[in-house]
Interface confidence: low
């Protein structure tokens, strides 16, 4: 698809970790756009042939989604318009660990940021009352 804007936009990610078997969040924010229809979000994972997730024209576009992520991903569709491109990853697997790219296109331009995602059997911190 074509790029309507010529400038780069700021995209920000935060390294995070996911507990195997639970749901995880890959955090990504960007400079918001006025029109949802002008926003494209692509999540990619290095070493994976297809996409992790794509959201464009206000809805998910999953025809190129890689099999290893099938049925396990979602963006927060109601928050995209305010610049939240974070990805919810269901049932985190050991093999989900790696480098992800959050790639954004808006009418203002395009931008991307990488995110290191770690997976494991992380224990919850104990809370003493």
């Amino acid at each position: 698809f074509g790029i309507s804007g010529r400038h780069s936009i700021t995209v920000t990610t935060v390294a995070s970790a996911g507990n195997i078997g639970e749901d995880g969040i890959l955090s990504c924010t960007f400079e918001p756009d006025i029109k949802l229809s002008d926003i494209v979000i692509q999540w990619l994972k290095e070493g994976v042939l297809g996409l992790v997730h794509e959201f464009k024209e206000g809805k998910d576009e999953l025809s190129e989604q890689d099999e290893m992520f099938r049925g396990r991903t979602a963006v927060f569709a109601d928050q995209v318009i305010v610049g939240n491109a974070s990805l919810r990853l269901k049932n985190v697997q050991l093999t989900d660990a790696g480098t992800y790219k959050c790639y954004i296109i808006t009418s203002k331009g395009k931008g991307n940021a990488n995110l290191e995602y770690k997976t494991g059997a992380f224990s919850m911190p104990e809370v003493n009352v």
Epitope: G47, L49, E64, E67
Partner: antibody
């Protein structure tokens, strides 16, 4: 049973063309990316090309770029490799393989010999 | 392009031996490395993916380790059926690249 079956290999003269096919069965073909990998006689494995599940992403090795075309027909559960302007160095066993973390399912291979 | 340098290129060992094959990437490939076994006249078989995860049905004597640039395939106790050629492969980025192979022979 998950299976890949290549066909279409044979003897061809330099400059000639061949089309290889890879018939998939036992899994949802349309959900997986696919690869072609080749192995020259007595040599190691060489990646040739890859295609994503719905053909939106296609990649080639420099050695075949502009001469080979990877494609797929999800309605027929079949992967293709169109090989044009063949050279002696293209002589190899050609394997199709399913894309996963690595290549988790391989066909038995089909032999391509380029010789005058 | 990312080069995968495998060593040794050949190795003689006996049944029951512990064998280690190494693979070094020319730049970091995170944990996007697979190991394959190939026997003469046969297609390669996936043994290990994501550097250390054993493929379903692969015996536990096969293990993989490493991340970044240095990777290892270990066979803890060689069995007669393990004599074959082994390849590492990176799937971190295209072009996908393989090591040159390690031929494991009976001593």
């Amino acid at each position: 049973e998950v299976q890949l079956l290549e066909s279409g290999g044979g003897l061809v003269q330099p400059g000639g063309s061949l089309r290889l096919s890879c018939a998939a069965s036992g899994f949802t073909f349309s959900s997986y990316g696919m690869h072609w990998v080749r192995q020259a006689p007595g040599k190691g494995l060489e990646w040739v090309a890859s295609i994503s599940s719905s053909s939106g992403y296609i990649y080639y090795a420099d050695s075949v770029k502009g001469r080979f075309t990877i494609s797929r027909d999800n309605s027929k559960n079949t992967l293709y490799l169109q090989m044009n302007s063949l050279r002696a160095e293209d002589t190899a066993v050609y394997y199709c393989a399913r894309a996963s973390s690595g290549m988790d399912v391989w066909g038995q291979g089909t032999t391509v010999t380029v010789s005058s | 392009d990312i080069q995968m340098t495998q060593s040794p290129s050949s190795l003689s060992a006996s049944v029951g031996d512990r064998v280690t094959i190494t693979c070094r990437a020319s730049q970091s490939v995170s944990s996007a490395v697979a190991w394959y076994q190939q026997k003469p006249g046969k297609a390669p078989k996936l043994l290990i993916y994501a550097a250390s995860i054993r493929e379903s049905g692969v015996p536990s004597r096969f293990s993989g380790s490493g991340s970044g640039t240095d990777f290892t395939l270990t066979i803890s106790s060689l069995q007669p059926e393990d004599f074959a050629t082994y390849y590492c492969q990176q799937y971190y980025s295209t072009p996908l690249t393989f090591g040159q192979g390690t031929k494991l022979e009976i001593k």
